[in-house]
């Protein structure tokens, strides 16, 4: 039998990915990070 039509069983949560670079002073260089949903993860 063919399968009936259904969407994927896996939910997709859309979140904003924000890359940022922050200057923390000439002696320390810069921090590059990745923010996912408001949390810095890298």
């Amino acid at each position: 039998d063919a399968e009936f039509r259904h969407d994927s069983g896996y939910e997709v949560h859309h979140q904003k990915l924000v890359f940022f670079a922050e200057d923390v002073g000439s002696n320390k260089g810069a921090i590059i990070g990745l923010m996912v949903g408001g949390v810095v993860i890298a």
Epitope: D1, A2, E3, F4, R5, H6, D7, S8, G9, Y10
Partner: antibody
């Protein structure tokens, strides 16, 4: 609120073509993921799924009846239609129009009141 | 076709008792997307069927928590923990994974 209402001829003779209309409100068949279908029930017996049509005009049929069934829609008028050719006494039943989506409403959450067909010579 | 076999076909119960209805599918009704489209509907005399449970164990909006669904693969159960008079009617299991979509023959719940 969501409502569905079936209409049909009531009585047909064997070999005639059945034309059913489902008029609905409270949702749109232009909405991605939405679908409307037909289920029938002979008096005092169980339920049999017939066909389903999706917002993008994709159609599914019961293979045992596919050669006799045609489902179609008019999204702008909020209507779905079912035609069954060459009816026989075995097609005597109550015909229900049902809503089912592919996403959040992926179940038969709303049913019409049903329209009764009698096939008799 | 996927055959849905319900037992018992008739279920006499007393008010306040627990009722249990079994539904077995002739083969797995796990869809390729990972979901199991097993549903339960109740049809009261003179009315259209109404949805109780979807995807095996999820109660539909407004359905009392006395109703619970369980199972997996090919073996499913509907339980009513404390039967009330308004629970009388015919209960149908249904699979929505494979074409044709198919219903069980129904279980008539009636009060003793």
């Amino acid at each position: 609120q969501v409502t569905l209402k079936e209409s049909g001829p009531g009585i047909l003779k064997p070999s005639q073509t059945l034309s059913l209309t489902c008029s609905f409100s409270g949702f749109s068949l232009s909405t991605s993921g939405m679908g409307v279908g037909w289920i029938r029930q002979p008096s005092g017996k169980g339920l049999e799924w017939l066909a389903h049509i999706w917002w993008d005009d994709d159609k599914y049929y019961n293979p045992s009846l596919k050669s006799r069934l045609t489902i179609s829609k008019d999204s702008s008028r909020n209507q779905v239609f079912l035609k069954i050719t060459s009816v026989d006494t075995a097609d005597t039943a109550t015909y229900y129009c049902v809503r089912r989506g592919t996403r959040l409403e992926d179940y038969f959450d709303f049913w019409g009141q049903g329209t009764t067909l009698t096939v008799s010579s | 076709d996927v055959l849905m076999t319900q037992t018992p076909l008739s279920l006499p119960v007393s008010l306040g008792d627990q009722a249990s209805i079994s539904c077995r599918s002739s083969r797995s009704i796990v869809h390729s997307n990972g979901n199991t489209y097993l549903e339960w509907y109740l049809q009261k005399p003179g009315q259209s069927p109404k949805l109780l449970i979807f995807k095996v164990s999820n109660r539909f909006s407004g359905v009392p928590d006395r109703f619970s669904g369980s199972g997996s693969g090919t073996d499913f159960t509907l339980k009513i923990s404390r039967v009330e008079a308004e629970d009388q009617g015919v209960y149908y299991c249904f699979q929505g994974s494979h074409v044709p979509l198919t219903f069980g023959a129904g279980t008539k719940l009636e009060l003793k």
